[in-house]
């Protein structure tokens, strides 16, 4: 007769791992006991448990709960075991012995290999700015029996850099995401993608890039000046930013306060009907948290009889 | 320390029953298994079985099925062994014993034994 | 059941000098990691005491002159350089199988 086993049986953190010890023998030979031990303590070999054709099952103190017989219907000849809900601590080296009738004693080794899935962390970068060089986006972190593969997945442009810590019984990997931070990758996702062989499918952990910037600011709305004449309704000025955060818009006028009738709604400066007393430096200043930005436009007033005046002017001058 | 204590000698009639007793100490009883082993007088050593404390699984050696009955009492951390039906045969210093930390074989912890006198 | 057999029964040896105890097993005893094979020594009125584990593995606190060889099913115990205190039966154990079974003892004397 021979034993049949595994030579490793890999099981996921909290699992069952079932211990496969069957004695194939010729007829009418006979089990009388199988004694299981984990084989790779320093001091000696520690019982796991006595399987005795007699006596039944016995499981020593140190296992009391953990260590059961597969399920009915049981073979006589099959002195397989089961180790509930496995930790990292099981994870080592198991003998069976076997003691037959008549042709005596066999013994089979097996590893017992316990995967212990990560549980990923994404841990964003300082705040991201235009303008800085190569920055950390963001780092994320896996610690998993075996070491879990951590890589990052995302249209953005940068560089990676991964370093691994071995513990006892485990291994955390750490990669860093580098960019040089643009406005265009604002909104952009980056995600960790951490795989591990006791994971049923990939973890993926994204993360949105915020890039802090404050675009040039520029004013729309004096495209044509002869548009700028007395008596004009509806007349507006609009400030033109963009950024992240978004920004907040200021209106004020250089050379004296903002006249009265005109109104101020966020980006936009609103005039009632013109008047000379409306021409002016008028400055927006927008801002965010990152950084502020100025422009300044000179509205001029026409007034249409003055024009047609000088036109007669022009005229008779000639 | 570990310690296994013992009871004292017997001297007991043929046919009659006695319990001995293995007091433990220094470590945590439910922890390890407890075995008891005879010697007879000027002779080897002969294993007579073992017991789980945590939950009072017994093996006995065939040759004392009937003969020996094991026990625990976990309150007391203290092991018993009962030998019934004694004849001479029967006398002979029993030993109460506990493998070492981290091993489960090899007996590192001794009663210091108990006499057990047969005879009329 | 596994019958394990000690030679000699009884030992004479000078202070000084090596002692060989023999203990063979009627079937192995020995797996690729450990050979489940203990060495005791007892003195008269005293439990036995755990001087070898694991054949070769050597019990805390035991004497450096005691050592332990062998597998599968011929085991050795030396002593040496044998002293007046290691005068005392000496014994061979199994835990392979159950039931664990010993050795019929060897006398050592150190003359």
């Known amino acids: 007769g021979e034993l049949e086993t595994s030579d490793v049986v890999t099981v996921v953190l909290g699992q069952d791992a079932k211990l496969p010890c069957f004695y194939r023998g010729d007829s009418g030979e006979q089990v009388g006991q199988v004694a299981w031990a984990r084989v790779d303590a320093g001091e000696g070999a520690q019982e796991l448990a006595l399987l005795h054709s007699k006596y039944g099952l016995h499981v020593s103190p140190a296992y009391e709960g953990r260590v059961e017989q597969p399920p009915p219907p049981r073979n006589p000849l099959d002195g397989s075991v089961l180790l509930r809900n496995a930790v990292q601590a099981d994870e080592g080296e198991y003998e069976c012995r076997v003691s037959t009738f008549p042709a005596g004693s066999f013994q089979a080794r097996l590893r017992l290999r316990v995967l212990v899935p990560p549980l990923p962390s994404l841990n964003p970068g300082p705040a991201l700015e235009e303008g800085q060089g190569l920055t950390l986006a963001a780092s994320c972190t896996a610690e998993g029996s075996p070491a879990p593969s951590v890589t990052w997945d995302t249209e953005v442009k940068g560089t990676t850099s991964s370093r691994s810590f071995k513990h006892s019984r485990s291994a955390a990997v750490t990669s860093e995401f580098h960019l040089v931070p643009s406005r265009s990758m604002n909104g952009q996702p980056l995600t960790c993608v951490v795989s591990h062989p006791g994971l049923l499918q990939d973890q993926r952990i994204t993360h949105i890039l915020h890039v802090s910037f404050l675009a040039e600011a520029s004013v729309r709305g004096l495209e044509d000046q002869n548009l700028w004449h007395i008596g004009r309704e509806g007349a507006m000025l609009k400030c033109l930013s963009e950024g992240q955060p978004p920004p907040s818009y200021n209106w004020t006028r250089l050379d004296g306060p903002l006249p009265s009738g005109v109104r101020v709604d966020g980006d936009t400066l609103g005039f009632p009907p013109l008047t000379t007393e409306h021409s002016g430096i008028y400055v927006c200043h927008v801002s965010n948290e990152f950084s502020s930005r100025d422009s300044q436009v000179t509205v001029d007033v026409l007034d249409p009889q003055e024009d047609s005046g000088k036109q007669v002017d022009l005229v008779s001058a000639s | 320390e570990v310690q296994l204590q013992q009871s004292g000698p017997e001297l007991v009639k043929p046919g009659a029953s006695v319990k001995i007793s293995c007091k433990t100490s220094?470590?945590?009883?439910?922890?390890?298994?407890i075995h008891w082993v005879k010697q007879n007088h000027g002779k080897s050593l002969e294993w007579i079985g073992r017991?789980?404390?945590?939950?009072?699984?017994?093996i006995h050696n065939q040759n004392f099925m009937g003969k020996a009955t094991l026990t625990v009492d976990k309150s007391s951390s203290t092991a018993y062994m009962e030998l019934r039906s004694l004849t001479s045969e029967d006398s002979a210093v029993c030993y109460c014993?506990?493998?070492?930390?981290?091993?489960?074989?090899?007996?590192?912890?001794w009663g210091q034994g108990t006499l057990v006198t047969v005879s009329a | 059941d596994i019958v394990m057999t000690q030679s000699p029964t009884s030992l004479v040896v000078s202070l000084g000098q090596r002692a060989t105890i023999s203990c063979r097993a009627s079937q192995s005893v020995t797996t690729p990691r450990y050979s489940y094979m203990h060495w005791y020594q007892q003195k008269p009125g005293q439990p036995p005491k755990l001087l070898i584990k694991y054949a070769s593995n050597l019990e805390s606190g035991v004497p450096a002159r005691f050592s332990g060889s062998g597998s599968g099913t011929d085991f050795t115990l030396n002593i040496h350089p044998v002293e007046e205190e290691d005068t005392a039966t000496y014994y061979c154990?199994?835990?392979?199988?159950?039931?664990?079974?010993f050795g019929g003892g060897t006398k050592l004397e150190i003359k």
């Open positions: 014993a506990r493998s070492g930390y981290g091993s489960s074989y090899g007996f590192a912890y």
């Open positions: 017991i789980n404390p945590k939950n009072g699984d017994i």
């Open positions: 220094g470590y945590t009883f439910t922890e390890y298994t």
């Open positions: 154990q199994h835990s392979w199988e159950i039931p664990y079974t």
